[in-house]
């Protein structure tokens, strides 16, 4: 039970870290290539992980201007790191009925990042709701 709880905590930490990285990138939105990217919104239940992978696959890029290029590139790279898997995530990977990435509305980097953050927050909330007891921080 303890290792399962630690796994849950690791997952929660990773999702929370992704939000912090998104917030960091939002500070540099003017230094990103103003390209339109698929940005899932109002994702249907059980398609969260599919939408998450669309955000991770999107070609967010630094405009290579100014002093911020390194921090932007590191942040983008960290956003693409695979989070610890959960049972819900494993189950959703087998769903074939979720929309393809290309079918989602394309948005510029600012809105793309805002929608990514909203999805991450939704996933954290779902994750917490599925836990019946125990502290996230113990």
């Amino acid at each position: 039970h303890k290792s399962s709880s630690q796994g849950q905590d690791r997952h929660m930490i990773r999702m929370r870290q992704l939000i912090d990285i998104v917030d960091q990138l939002k500070n540099y939105v003017n230094d990103l290539v103003p390209e339109f990217l698929p940005a899932p919104e109002d994702v249907e239940t059980n398609c969260e992980w599919s939408a998450f992978s669309c955000f991770q696959k999107a070609q967010l890029k630094s405009a290579n201007t100014g002093n911020n290029e390194r921090i932007i590139n590191v942040s983008i790279k960290k956003l693409k790191r695979k989070p610890p898997s959960t049972n819900a995530g494993r189950r959703q990977k087998h769903r074939l009925t979720c929309p393809s990435c290309d079918s989602y509305e394309k948005k510029p980097p600012k809105e793309f990042l805002e929608r990514f953050k909203s999805l991450l927050q939704k996933m954290i909330h779902q994750h917490l709701s599925s836990r019946t007891h125990g502290s996230e921080d113990s």
Partner: antibody, heavy 117, light 106 residues
């Protein structure tokens, strides 16, 4: 058990720099990011930033950008916070706090930094 | 930046009293709110995370509620060890603390 042990009190002159350390034990160091928070005498808590202990990625409070540098040494499970161009308003207790899943779950004992000419 | 405003800044109460502290965010932070307790000369300790969830080892007399911009920390029956300063903290966008509420003995 999780422990965060910080370095001792420091007295610095205005314009100088200070480097505070925070040694972690009781868990896998690189599994958890670390926050730094400060508290001026009789005042509230102020978030300074955080560091990814696995690869020194940092996110700083805009207020301290350009003056604060957070680093780490994985061989000793220690994180560092350096603040430069010190002024009297930087007199405060500086805390490290572990980045738990949704909160700062463990805190160091604090390091008092006094800036005085 | 998200500002957090706590009220009152201090209050006097007796052992056994029900105490309520409020925290208001300058914008919607959903449930992304934590509460910490700090005693003089000590580091803060986590009490409640994600608005209403009790951190391990925290007595059940502590509870949290709210959503959006308005949040409450309640101590149902104040104990001698509860006299301290309490801080709310948002983690919707990076981190910001409230100014603190000092709970003193009446």
């Amino acid at each position: 058990q999780v422990q965060l042990v910080q370095s001792g009190a420091e007295v610095k002159k205005p314009g100088a720099s200070v480097k505070v350390s925070c040694k972690a034990s009781g868990y896998t160091f690189t599994d958890y990011w670390m926050h730094w928070v400060r508290q001026a005498p009789g005042q509230g808590l102020e978030w300074m930033g955080l560091i990814d202990t696995s690869d020194v990625y940092t996110i700083y409070n805009q207020k301290f950008k350009g003056r604060v540098t957070m680093t780490r040494d994985t061989s000793t499970s220690t994180v560092y916070m350096e603040l430069s161009s010190l002024r009297s308003e930087d007199t405060a207790v500086y805390y490290c706090a572990r980045y738990g899943p949704l909160a700062m779950d463990y805190w160091g004992q604090g390091t008092l930094v006094t800036v005085s000419s | 930046d998200i500002q957090m405003t706590q009220s009152p800044s201090s209050l006097s109460a007796s052992v056994g009293d029900r105490v309520t502290i409020t925290c208001r965010a300058s914008q919607d932070i959903s449930n992304y709110l934590n509460w910490y307790q700090q005693k003089p000369g000590k580091a803060p300790k986590l009490l409640i995370y994600y608005t209403s969830r009790l951190h391990s080892g925290v007595p059940s007399r502590f509870s949290g509620s709210g959503s959006g911009t308005d949040f409450t920390l309640t101590i149902s029956s104040l104990q001698p060890e509860d006299f301290a300063t309490y801080y709310c903290q948002q983690f919707h966008t990076l981190r910001t603390f409230g100014g603190g509420t000092k709970v003193e003995i009446k």
